[in-house]
């Protein structure tokens, strides 16, 4: 079991336990910060990030941000707490096992963001509409 001296002196945001006292391990996410990317006009892309990190806090999830402007395309991969906005946007899909990109309104650029909660899930970023549960045909399949 967990040594009692660990439980007594830790910060609440650094340790999450269940009813049996087992401690939740943080998410494993791709974490390359901002890198130039060749991902463009594709249904899905791999991050090409070779760094997988243990997120700092157990509540953090994996995030990917794809940005395109007149000069370049970048892909950002990080861990982030879904209770806090990222780039001024709420992480609505943080519980999703897949990183399904959603467009956000940002002046002067095309901006897509996704978040997810499975191992290295921000390695495979999905733009295709067929994965989007706002698609009525997909909802029909799910609920049949």
């Amino acid at each position: 079991t967990i040594p009692p001296h660990v439980q007594k002196s830790v910060n609440n945001d650094m340790i999450v336990t269940d009813n049996n006292g087992a401690v939740k391990f943080p998410q494993l996410c791709k974490f390359c910060d901002v890198r130039f990317s060749t991902c463009d006009n594709q249904k899905s892309c791999m991050s090409n990030c070779s760094i997988t990190s243990i997120c700092e806090k157990p509540q953090e999830v994996c995030v990917a941000v794809w940005r395109k402007n007149d000069e370049n395309i970048t892909l950002e991969t990080v861990c982030h707490d879904p209770k806090l906005p990222y780039h001024d946007f709420i992480l609505e899909d943080a519980a999703s096992p897949k990183c399904i990109m959603k467009e956000k309104k940002k002046p002067g650029e095309t901006f897509f963001m996704c978040s997810c909660s499975s191992d290295e899930c921000n390695d495979n970023i999905i733009f295709s509409e067929e994965y989007n549960t706002s698609n009525p045909d997909l909802l029909l399949v799910i609920f049949q």
Epitope: T1, V23, F25, P97, D119
Partner: nanobody, 124 residues
């Protein structure tokens, strides 16, 4: 009864190295992911490194990447943490921990058994 016993801690100068060991007993060691965590004085618990059951996949916190190496010897039921280029901020009690369930995949990892810890002090 599951038991985890850490050893190898001590006082080391900045830039030095230490190798921590964790002897495991009471469970089928090679079926479980294992991890190292640490707690600095007055600070929260920080997960340092994770290793898959067979030892082929390893993961690290950004704070130790490139300096620490996790490994395991399943024939000896022992987990290791090689710590190089140690810094003052690495001073902490280091714990090894066993994952609660042997399942892999995308289930939430929870760790239910811990050693009593070994103190690492980095100071000149």
């Amino acid at each position: 009864e599951v038991q985890l016993l850490e050893s190898g801690g001590g006082l080391v100068q900045p830039g030095g190295s230490l190798r921590l060991s964790c002897a495991a007993s009471g469970f089928t060691f090679f079926n479980y992911e294992m991890a190292w965590a640490r707690q600095a004085p007055g600070k929260g618990l920080e997960w340092v490194s994770l290793i898959s059951a067979e030892g082929t996949r390893t993961y690290y916190a950004n704070s130790v990447k490139g300096r620490f190496t996790i490994s395991r010897d399943n024939s000896k039921n022992t987990l290791y943490l090689q710590m190089n280029s140690l810094r003052a901020e690495d001073t902490a009690v280091y714990y090894c921990a066993k994952r609660r369930d042997a399942s892999m995949g995308h289930t939430t990892r929870r760790f239910d058994h811990w050693g009593q810890g070994t103190l690492v002090t980095v100071s000149s």
